[in-house]
């Protein structure tokens, strides 16, 4: 068997809402993956599991099942959404994200994704993780790759 390539492209959109009573931020983050099947037979993308971390704390998880079948030597782009919650124990983040004196409220999130593919009863898992900028202050649509956090070192939060 040849490889199945998974490429995390980036954040496609981030939609934000607030609970002022709980001082909590809700971010619905839609991500884009490219999955390439280099084989001469079809493979099934069985599931995608994803999680988002902020400052080493998991703030959101998602799982998609029975997603798609990728034909021989084909590539599919898949969007998946992770609902995240920055809760009251990170109260300072509510202040930052709702601060009107700051115009771009970028926070650095670690996106982790695992894609499980199957073919002829064989299962394979491919994982990726990437740091991304997300604006927690307003709804934002990104051009693919625009939200990339380029610092190779783990950011200090």
């Amino acid at each position: 068997p040849r490889s199945i390539d998974v490429k995390y492209i980036g954040v496609k959109s981030a939609y934000v809402s607030y609970d002022v009573q709980k001082r909590t931020i809700y971010l619905n983050i839609t991500n884009t993956l490219n999955i390439t099947n280099n084989n001469y037979y079809s493979v099934e993308v069985e599931n995608i599991t994803a999680q988002v971390q902020f400052s080493k704390t998991v703030i959101g998880k998602a799982r998609l099942n029975n997603i798609t079948i990728i034909g021989p030597l084909d590539m599919k782009q898949i969007d998946y959404t992770v609902p995240t919650v920055i809760a009251e124990e990170m109260s300072y983040m509510y202040d930052f994200c709702t601060l009107i004196s700051i115009k771009v409220h970028n926070i650095v999130l670690m996106m982790q994704v695992t894609v499980t593919t199957t073919y002829f009863g064989h299962s394979e898992q491919i994982s990726q993780e990437r740091y991304q900028y997300v604006d927690c202050g307003r709804n934002t649509t990104y051009q693919l790759g625009q939200s990339e956090y380029l610092n190779v070192l783990q950011p200090q939060q």
């Epitope: 009573q21 001082r23 509510y94 202040d95 930052f96 601060l99 009107i100």
Partner: antibody, heavy 119, light 112 residues
Framework: EVQLVESGGDLVKPGGSLKLSCVAS????????MSWVRQTPDKRLEWVAT????????YYPDSVKGRLTVSRDNAKNTLYLQMSSLKSEDTAIYYC????????????WGQGTTLTVSS | DIVMTQAAFSNPVTLGTSASISCRSS???????????LYWYLQKPGQSPQLLIY???NLASGVPNRFSSSGSGTDFTLRISRVEAEDVGVYYC?????????FGGGTKLEIK
Amino acid sequence: EVQLVESGGDLVKPGGSLKLSCVASGFTFSGYGMSWVRQTPDKRLEWVATISSGSFYIYYPDSVKGRLTVSRDNAKNTLYLQMSSLKSEDTAIYYCARQNFYYGCEDYWGQGTTLTVSS
Amino acid sequence: DIVMTQAAFSNPVTLGTSASISCRSSKSLLHSNGITYLYWYLQKPGQSPQLLIYQMSNLASGVPNRFSSSGSGTDFTLRISRVEAEDVGVYYCAQNLELPWTFGGGTKLEIK
């Protein structure tokens, strides 16, 4: 209904001190940043202080830095402005205002309290 | 500091006709995120200021759609399509692109 009620305005001698208060009701006070804006006798508006919802971020213009201190007590739904080393140019109506993070500005203002600095 | 400039008085207008109030900033208020950080407030006689327009062209909640606003990065116009008696007061433009946030001197709407 959003309500902001300022109090504490008075006649003060130059060099004196005063503390203004603003009691908020009709909204979740702890979820909103707040500002103080003053209106001078010639009707000009001047922003003088901002405090974030949890008091993590505080901003002043250079003209009042070191003399004015903004604070808040979320348990009491109250915003404060402590003023010291007062000058005649601090004479104004002082308004407290709620910040709307969706609008990106102050959306509701109180009725104001008057400070007069004069000997 | 960003200086906001307004004429002290508008051209006198007749009730039911349209009025325009201008404001100019000393620096562009258009941010790289595409938002223009220009606001309009109305202070009616004996009252505190009330928000009319946020981020240059958006009507605040409860504001009649007789009000509209447009502009470039530095020149802005507030329009009232059919002036009513309750529109009388002083109109202030303001910016909060940069600290310190600053206001224009205000334009008093004059009725003929």
